[in-house]
């Protein structure tokens, strides 16, 4: 009889993670007597996958009934494939022997590659907020995919970005891979409602890419603009001064009124007007009893926004000569009025 040949007809097999992989092997003869074994890898470090003779291999089933004498098919099926199962599998015929069976002949090997989907991309932004015209970095990460080929794109509000750097690790062969990308985005005042999107395309996704998003609202701080104005009053001994705080984001804002440098009142913004671009407006007003002042008064609206250094705007309130003459007879009494909102500036 011709000497036994071990035939592994497929050089490579590709399987999606979670599926079963069938590795085909046939013998041309049953001589010599001895078991068939399957290994992953070659050489001293090879891993036993199946031994016809003995052992418990819960994920492995034989495609044919190996106890039938005329059976020359020694194909196996491995269930629930994961990326860790990737490698080259060898079907090996042993000759019965002692103290160990003797390797008689090996098949050429079948390379099993595992197609594994990338994890949902996770996009994270900067740790601290930045103001418009500054550049911030966003990162996108996805893991566990195979094969290595992958495409990553960045978008801002549907427009593709070009300023980004992407790495796929590891550089060499691996059971699965990770991707890490950093995009640089220039902030604009209108970015409160903007989104950045990381889009990943991979062979396992069948043309339906995965997307991860981040809101620029988490990354941006739009500082307020202040305007202090005096409103007309019927009573000549009262002045109504308003501080219009406009186009700021995020909400957190504390306002302090100072009269000639002395704190008159501090309040925290609560009822805000939201603009179409996502920024907020707020107005505070101060009712000043002009009779309490002999001289002109400098009113300062001081705003601390989002924990940043305070910004301020001052207004010089003129005290008329008539009021100055009678001022000494009037008890110093500044009436502080409650705040009132001002209509939004679309």
């Amino acid at each position: 009889e011709d000497e036994l040949q071990v035939i592994q007809p497929e050089k490579s097999v590709s399987v999606a993670a979670g599926e079963s992989a069938t590795l085909r092997c046939a013998m041309t003869s049953l001589i010599p007597v001895g078991p068939i074994m399957w290994f992953r890898g070659a050489g001293a470090g090879r891993e036993l996958i199946y031994n016809q003779k003995e052992g418990h291999f819960p994920r492995v089933t034989t495609v044919s009934e190996l106890t039938k004498r005329n059976n020359l098919d020694f194909s196996i099926s491995i269930s629930n494939i994961t990326p860790a199962d990737a490698g080259t599998y060898y079907c090996v015929k042993f000759r019965k022997g002692s103290p160990d069976d003797v390797e008689f002949k090996s098949g050429a090997g079948t390379e099993l590659s595992v197609r594994a989907k990338p994890s949902a991309p996770v996009v994270s932004g900067p740790a601290v907020r930045a103001t418009p015209e500054h550049t911030v970095s966003f990162t996108c990460e996805s893991h566990g995919f195979s094969p290595r080929d992958i495409t990553l794109k960045w978008f801002k509000n549907g427009n593709e970005l070009s300023d980004f750097q992407t790495n796929v690790d590891p550089a060499g062969d691996s059971v699965s891979y990770s991707i890490h990308s950093t995009a640089r985005v220039v902030l604009t005042r209108g970015d409160v409602h903007s989104q950045v999107i990381c889009e990943i395309a991979h062979i396992t996704l069948q043309g339906d890419p995965l997307r991860g998003t981040a809101n620029l609202s988490e990354a941006i701080r739009v500082p307020p603009t202040l305007e202090v104005t005096q409103q007309p009053m019927r009573a000549e001994n009262q002045a109504n001064v308003t501080c219009q705080v406009s186009n700021f984001y995020p909400r957190g804002l504390q306002l302090t009124w100072l009269e000639n440098g002395n704190v008159s009142r501090t309040e925290t913004a609560s009822t805000l007007i939201e603009n179409k671009d996502g920024t907020y407006n707020w107005m505070s007003w101060l009712l000043v009893n002009t009779c309490a002042h002999r001289d002109d008064v400098v009113l300062t609206c001081q705003v601390e926004h989002d924990g940043q250094q305070a910004v301020s705007k001052s207004y010089a309130l003129e005290i008329s000569a008539h009021q100055k003459e009678h001022g000494s007879d009037i008890t110093h009494e500044a009436a502080l009025a409650p705040t009132a909102p001002l209509g939004g500036s679309g």
Partner: antibody, heavy 118, light 107 residues
């Protein structure tokens, strides 16, 4: 049903000959290694001879040159030609099938008695 | 030739007992060891191959273990039909050889 049935045993004088037959049913005999095992009355089991699927033959030392194992594929039968028989060859002879990949004995015949006596 | 030695040669036990028979090879036989059961006037019956694998139809109360030179056959709970003679056999190389047998008797 897989079955082995031996025949051809009997009483023979020392120096005489006998041919044992084993008829296989339920499987193709030529696809398996086949064996003869014997057991003297009140004694243990002794392996006698084997024939491989390639026609290779094997014997225990005490029968070498006297016994010949063979098979006839057309009749799906195994044979043991015993010549120059001795009193020590007296035993029940069993036909046995070897297992698929390791030749472990799996199917036994019921046996046939060979008595060598003058 | 490889010598196979069984112990004990005979053993008395009661129904329900757990019994162990040992078999030693004169040289390493890997795990190519078989166990057979034989009742008076009957052909042997194959129980175990490759030291621990049960032949089809053999009840799980029979179990085998060992590798190299030392092997055991265990019957977990003896039933009346289990009283018989048990043989071990090496089949790693020709000539295949049997142990001398262990006769299991009712106490």
């Amino acid at each position: 049903e897989v079955q082995l049935v031996e025949s051809g045993g009997g009483l023979v004088q020392p120096g005489g000959s006998l041919r044992l037959s084993c008829a296989a049913s339920g499987f193709t005999l030529s696809s398996y290694d086949m064996h003869w095992v014997r057991q003297a009355t009140g004694k243990g089991l002794e392996w006698v001879s084997a024939i491989g699927t390639a026609g290779d033959t094997y014997y225990t030392g005490s029968v070498k040159g006297r016994f010949t194992i063979s098979r006839e594929n057309a009749k799906n039968s195994l044979y043991l030609q015993m010549n120059s028989l001795r009193a020590s060859d007296t035993a029940v002879y069993y036909c046995v099938r070897g297992g698929v990949w390791d030749d472990a004995f799996d199917i036994w015949g019921q046996g046939t008695m060979v008595t060598v006596s003058s | 030739d490889i010598q196979m030695t069984q112990s004990p040669s005979s053993l008395s036990a009661s129904v329900g007992d757990r019994v162990t028979i040992t078999c030693r090879a004169s040289q390493d036989i890997n795990n190519y060891l078989a166990w057979f059961q034989q009742k008076p006037g009957k052909a042997p019956k194959s129980l175990i191959y490759t030291a621990s694998s049960l032949h089809s139809g053999v009840p799980s109360k029979f179990s085998g273990s060992g590798s190299g030179t030392d092997f055991t056959l265990t019957i977990s709970s003896l039933q009346p039909e289990d009283f018989a003679t048990y043989y071990c056999q090496q089949y790693v190389s020709y000539p295949y050889t049997f142990g001398q047998g262990t006769k299991l008797e009712i106490k």
